[in-house]
């Protein structure tokens, strides 16, 4: 569960479960910075704009990222 009211890391918990790409509004990859020392992956869902934090170390999440970027590259001219 993410909390965006902070200048530190955003995520409270991280999930190893990939989200259904069809349910996805957007997928943000926030690089490590002076505010947060780790990469954060935040999935915004279409329903209620709910945000889910995904575990960047999870194999399933890495596969999801690959699938999403593949889908995006197909769409871009």
């Amino acid at each position: 569960v993410p909390l965006s009211r902070t200048v530190r890391c955003t995520c409270i918990s991280i999930s190893n479960q990939p989200v259904n790409p069809r349910s996805l509004e957007k997928l943000e990859i926030i690089p490590a910075s002076q505010f947060c020392p780790r990469v954060e992956i935040i999935a915004t869902m279409k329903k209620k704009g709910e945000k889910r934090c995904l575990n960047p170390e999870s194999k399933a999440i890495k596969n999801l990222l690959k699938a999403v970027s593949k889908e995006r590259s197909k769409r871009s001219p």
Partner: antibody, heavy 119, light 111 residues
Framework: QVQLVESGGGVVQPGRSHTLSCAAS????????IHWVRQAPGKGLEWVAV????????FYADSVKGRFTISRDNSQNTVYLQMTDLRPDDTAVYYC????????????WGKGTLVTVSS | NFMLTQPHSVSESPGKTVTISCTGS????????VQWYQQRPGSAPITVIY?????PSGVPDRFSGSIDSSSNSASLTISGLRTDDEADYYC??????????FGGGTKVTVL
């Protein structure tokens, strides 16, 4: 299976400090935020605090802000609630609960530990 | 301040249906998900509904949740009421100011 076990309850004098522990097992503790929720005798549930999976974020209810501190030791799978300047109205059963990683709910709870603030 | 208000108690006979309301004030209840927790006497809470209407595995389909935006309220419905449903039930949601917010709880008595 997921298990959360609170300890450290007891009788504490007003104005004193006290620390509660929550030992976790059966899940990927290092990926999970942990909450403390309390329940005064005969009353409802009151959210107290949460700490993020890596300890970088901590949030508190207004009623305990500045007096309570939540912390965690991921090597020991344990979360702590340090309570200072305790008052009689802090008397409650204190539960720790796991943050649901896929929504804003608390998916598993411990059995609780009773803290009584009394002289 | 976002608050959730529940009736203090409801009672019904075994086999009947009971509905518990949870009314939001100071904000829109459908902005974030609503959860419902069951707390039997002397026990810790367990989740019976999450994300408005989802049931965790092991929770019977007699329990259902819904949201009514027009009345800014959530409801928990228990059908085919049984004696072991006698418990306190709490709604809970999330608010960016107050963070995790609980309703005051509703005592369900099976007559």
């Amino acid at each position: 299976q997921v298990q959360l076990v609170e300890s450290g309850g007891g009788v504490v004098q007003p104005g004193r400090s006290h620390t509660l522990s929550c030992a976790a097992s059966g899940f990927a503790f290092k990926n999970s935020g942990i909450h403390w929720v309390r329940q005064a005798p005969g009353k409802g549930l009151e959210w107290v605090a949460v700490i993020s999976y890596d300890g970088s974020n901590k949030f508190y209810a207004d009623s305990v802000k500045g007096r309570f501190t939540i912390s965690r030791d991921n090597s020991q799978n344990t979360v702590y609630l340090q309570m200072t300047d305790l008052r009689p109205d802090d008397t409650a059963v204190y539960y720790c609960a796991r943050d649901g990683s896929e929504s804003e709910y608390l998916d598993y709870w411990g059995k609780g530990t009773l803290v009584t603030v009394s002289s | 301040n976002f608050m959730l208000t529940q009736p203090h108690s409801v009672s019904e006979s075994p086999g009947k249906t009971v509905t518990i309301s949870c009314t939001g004030s100071g904000g829109s209840i459908d902005r974030n998900y609503v959860q419902w927790y069951q707390q039997r006497p002397g026990s810790a809470p367990i989740t019976v509904i999450y994300e408005d209407n989802q049931r965790p595995s092991g929770v019977p389909d007699r329990f259902s949740g819904s949201i009514d935006s027009s009345s800014n309220s959530a409801s928990l419905t228990i059908s085919g009421l049984r004696t072991d449903d006698e418990a306190d039930y709490y709604c809970q949601s999330y608010d960016s100011i107050n963070l995790w917010v609980f309703g005051g709880g509703t005592k369900v008595t099976v007559l």
